[in-house]
């Protein structure tokens, strides 16, 4: 099970002093930022139990192991459920912790309850505060059961809850009709996946018998240990003030673990800390009692003496829960709770004994999950112990489990199991992903996703030229950095693979699946100049460029221009796609504007040096269209055009240009200047009699500006058709009184 | 869908016995407390008998103490009520309904929102 | 024994608003829940805890409690609102329940 503890710290005459910390003894729990470990995280979960909101609660991170909730500012922000979640991947576990008010109407007698797959479950509810109304259950928050209140026994509310199944589990309250969800009382149920003493899928599997309150998971067969206890079958006490799965944590404050709540992963649920009992864990032991909410008997025989953390403390001579073993028995010594291995690996694994008489070769036996007891190959006698080794054949996934070493004398036996985990090495589901190429190098992120178990030990990047039949070369890297594969050769595939590995011996996993990686092109070296540009057009600009001469073929497969607009902040890109191209034009440039201009060779995705920068001004943009223009027939083969000026002009316009089209024809249009633009009239001759004719006109500065609206106008009828229209212009005034 | 169906109401002589039933479909019914209430012709409606989930707890009117039991078969979800010593003034039309729960701010309170369609007891020599 | 109190008969014009009243020392601990009932059949639940309406009860129809007083408005009355309704709670015992004696509303 994941290494996980949440600490409730029960002093409850002052909320602001309460604090729930998130203790995780994970390798790398909470670093977050890493790949392998998400963070830690602890918050109230308002799904269930829903209280009146309250100041946010301020979440403090102690170290890349804890984290802390604090802010309480009155007794019923602590009312609910909080939780902790911790671990990465599938080992991602999360623990509750269920808050009740000390002064509900309703208390329960016992907060947590575990049981197993087809028990009946009673939560009981006791009456602080009576009210004369029914009492409604609540099951994850929604309606249950109902009691009267008269069906209260001995002052408690009792739900039965026969052959109870994993869905059962949850959060239940009590409640009083139409009181205040704070004054509910509060239950967690945690339903095992199978009947008692068993585990796995199936539930074929036997539990290893779990010491001192320990739980059987029912998924991994593993005991949850009560906080003070350790070992695979919760066998060893912790010193006292001490928890964790390694008894690595101490509990903090002067008085040890006093006034604390302990809750682990599921199937545990929250108990005192060994040695505390009572709804606050503010009670010591009474006499003869010991462990976690102080549920232990010691019973201790032979002289042993009560301890309220560990148990039976024994004299010389005993051992044994009870002291109920001579120490003539032979007994198995420092034999390792948990043993790892990588699968198909053939293990050495070593027993050691000692009693009196002195245990032998044969007296030692070790006893896999299956049944199947080997025997030792050799063994070391030694003045105190006998170590027996054994040599166990390649192992199986199937071989992962309780195993058992046993020793057998005359003076009696004794037997010691510890579990062996069998890991599968890792297996790359995913080719590595290539970040960036060159010509010679390649940068790789070998980091990928894989089958079977970690920790990642060791990364080994394997690659050669595609299609080559030459020796893979090796690189080992570190599993969090990317890799530069380096003295490559240009424009080359290459094939490229991982390999993980976890600790151990025969940790190595099978090759990942392989990916093509190709080196670029070789990087174009030539550095262009520009020979010289010419403005087009306002918004037009023709660059010309050359080349340095070498000898042999140009390595390049085209420019890029680079127009750099330093007052607007933007760049320009045009791709001249010829390595024989020496000149492009730039259309679609804003008028008026700086830019600075470069050009430079590409090949591939690699640009070469670029030409020294040139600076070039294009010209502004032309006036604004003319206003009002009308259009009036003198005669068949005239037409006068006023209009006003442009409004806003930039400078002084130099000319007007007016397009004239029969309207409907196919025909281009023709263009007449107007070059005195102090004119706002004009005349157009030489058009033919009854004709539809369209008008419109721009005035240009240094550049033509906008076109006017267009106005449409027929000559008049009978005449002659004529050359083809010109223009006279006078002041408009003139034109008129003619 | 919660339906309700009372049956086993009649004509009944002064003194005499009747048994109600009223079969409840469409949710667990033994999770639910049930009650019935009656109406004379042309009165008001009046509560007769609760019945808690478990069978363990149940409450009269006063009219009726003594005279009638409510019972309930969570294996049938049936509920029942055996009247005795029969009056006059027992003549109505009697219904059976469930009690619903509901949240309203984390206060939890009680309504009575499915109803039978009743069953016509009639009292007369 | 508690009892709730209510007025017999009330008369409302069309679309116009009325207010039928439940008074009762049960109603300082206890909202009226209440219920309609139309000629041969089963009562209806129409308003419940503070304000609550089930699905299907039009919004026009609208509960308040003051003291030991619960009151059903409806605003805007329709000629489908004619019928009897009954206002209920808990006794202040806690186990028996009680219902008001009945307003019968008359839509003019």
């Known amino acids: 099970a994941v290494d996980l503890t949440l600490l409730a710290n029960l002093r409850l005459t002052d909320p602001q002093r309460f604090f729930l910390t998130c203790v995780s003894g994970e390798a790398g729990a909470g670093r977050g930022s890493d790949a392998w470990g998400p963070p830690l995280l602890l918050e109230k979960d308002d799904r269930i139990v829903r209280t009146p909101p309250g100041p946010p609660l301020r979440l403090a991170r102690n170290g890349s192991h804890q984290v802390t909730l604090r802010g309480f500012s009155k007794p019923s922000d602590l009312v609910g459920v909080f939780s902790c979640v911790g671990g990465a991947g599938a080992r991602r576990t999360r623990v509750i912790y269920v808050h009740n008010s000390p002064g509900a109407h309703l208390l329960p007698d016992k907060v947590t309850h575990t049981v197993n797959k087809g028990d009946t479950a009673v939560l009981s509810a006791r009456v602080h505060k009576e009210k004369q109304t029914d009492v409604i259950w609540k099951s994850n928050g929604s309606y249950f059961y109902t009691l009267d209140w008269h069906e209260a026994q001995d002052g408690r509310f009792l739900l039965q809850l026969p052959n109870v199944q994993p869905p059962s589990s949850g959060i239940y309250s009590a409640t009083y009709l139409e009181a205040s969800p704070l004054g509910s009382a509060f239950f967690r149920l945690i339903v095992r996946g199978c009947g008692a003493g068993r585990w796995g899928p199936g539930c074929t599997k036997e539990c290893p018998g779990c010491l001192h309150g320990g739980v059987c998971h029912d998924h991994d067969g593993e005991c949850v240990c009560p906080p003070g206890f350790t070992g695979t079958r919760c066998e060893q006490a912790c010193r006292e003030g001490r928890f964790g799965q390694s008894c690595q944590e101490q509990c903090p404050g002067i008085s040890g673990c006093r006034g604390l709540t302990f809750c682990l992963p599921d199937p545990y649920g929250c108990s005192c800390g060994s040695g505390w009992r009572g709804s606050q864990c503010q009670e010591a032991c009474a006499p003869g009692h010991f462990g976690a909410d102080c549920r232990l008997q010691c019973q201790c025989q032979n002289g042993g003496t009560c301890d309220r953390f560990s148990g039976c403390v024994c004299p010389s001579g005993w051992h044994g829960v009870h002291c109920e073993k001579s120490d003539r028995i032979p007994q198995i010594l420092n034999m390792a709770s948990e043993l790892e291995f990588n699968l198909e690996t053939m293990p050495r694994i070593n027993c050691a004994a000692a009693g009196n008489p002195f245990p032998v070769r044969g007296s030692i036996e070790l006893r896999k999950p299956d049944g199947t007891v080997l025997l030792s190959t050799k063994a070391i006698v030694e003045p105190e112990k006998t170590t027996a080794e054994f040599e166990v054949p390649r192992l199986v996934l199937a071989d992962s489990g309780f195993w058992e070493c046993r020793v057998s004398t005359s003076g009696g036996q004794d037997s010691r199991r510890f579990k062996v985990n069998v890991k599968v090495p890792p297996v790359p589901l995913a080719a590595p992903r290539l970040l960036t190429k060159q010509s010679r190098q390649l940068v790789v992120s070998p980091l990928v996703s894989f089958s079977g178990d970690g920790p990642i030990s060791t990364v080994r990047l394997h690659y050669r030229p595609q299609d080559s039949t030459m020796d893979w070369s090796t690189i080992v890297v570190d599993p969090s950095e990317n890799v530069t594969l380096m003295n490559l050769r240009p424009k080359t595939g290459y094939s490229v693979r991982v390999q993980l590995s976890r600790p151990g011996e025969g940790g190595e996993g099978a090759w990942g699946p392989p990916t093509l990686m190709t080196t670029d092109c070789p990087e174009p070296l030539l550095q262009p100049w520009l020979e010289g540009w010419h403005v087009e057009g306002t918004d037009r600009l023709r660059v010309s460029w050359s080349l340095p001469l070498v000898p042999g073929p140009l390595v390049g497969d085209g420019f890029l221009l680079r127009l750099w607009d330093g007052t607007r902040g933007q760049e320009r890109r045009e791709n001249v796609s010829s390595p024989q191209a020496r000149t492009a034009l730039l259309t679609g440039l804003t008028p008026g504007t700086h830019y600075q201009l470069d050009v430079q060779l590409y090949h591939c995705t690699l640009l070469g040096p670029a030409s020294p920068p040139a600076h070039v001004l294009l010209p502004p943009s032309g006036p604004p269209a003319p206003r009002h223009l009308h259009a009036q027939a003198l005669s068949d083969s005239e037409i006068q055009l006023t209009w006003k000026h442009p409004e806003a002009l930039p400078g002084p316009i130099s000319k007007y240009v007016v397009e004239v089209q029969v309207a409907g024809g196919a025909g281009d249009p023709l263009w007449i200047d107007v070059d005195r633009p102090e004119e706002t009239s004009t005349i157009i001759r030489g058009l033919n009699a009854s004709t539809r004719y369209l008008f419109r006109m721009r005035a240009s500065i240094q550049g033509l500006g906008d076109w006017s609206n267009t106005v449409e106008e027929s000559t008049l009828g009978n005449g002659l058709q004529a050359e083809g229209p010109v223009q006279e212009s006078r002041a408009a005034e003139e034109g008129l009184d003619q | 869908e919660v339906q309700l169906l009372e049956s086993g109401g009649g004509l009944v002589q002064p003194g005499g016995s009747l048994r109600l039933s009223c079969a409840a479909s469409?949710?667990?019914?033994?999770?639910?407390?049930m009650l019935w209430v009656r109406q004379a012709p042309g009165k008001g409606l009046e509560w007769v008998s609760s019945?808690?989930?478990?069978?363990?707890?149940?409450s009269y009117a006063d009219s009726v103490k003594g005279r009638f039991t409510i019972s309930r078969d969570n294996s049938k979800n049936t509920l029942y009520l055996q009247m005795n010593s029969l009056r006059a003034e027992d003549t109505a039309v009697y219904y059976c309904a469930r009690a619903s729960y509901y949240d309203s701010g984390g206060y939890y309170r009680e309504n009575f929102q499915f109803w039978g369609q009743g069953t016509l007891v009639t009292v007369s020599s | 024994q508690s009892v709730l109190t209510q007025d017999p008969a009330v008369s409302v014009a069309l679309g116009q608003t009325v207010r039928i009243t439940c008074q009762g020392d049960s109603l300082r601990s206890y909202y009226a829940t209440w219920y309609q009932q139309k000629p041969g059949q089963a009562p209806v639940l129409v308003i419940y805890?503070?304000?609550n309406r089930p699905s299907g009860i039009p919004d026009r129809f609208s509960g308040s409690s003051s003291g030991n007083t619960g009151s059903l408005t409806i605003t805007g009355a329709q000629a489908e609102d004619e019928a009897d309704y009954y206002c209920n709670s808990r006794d202040t015992s806690g186990s028996h329940l009680l219902f008001g004696g009945g307003t019968k509303l008359t839509v003019l």
């Open positions: 019945i808690y989930p478990s069978g363990g707890w149940t």
């Open positions: 469409g949710f667990t019914f033994s999770q639910y407390k």
């Open positions: 805890g503070e304000n």
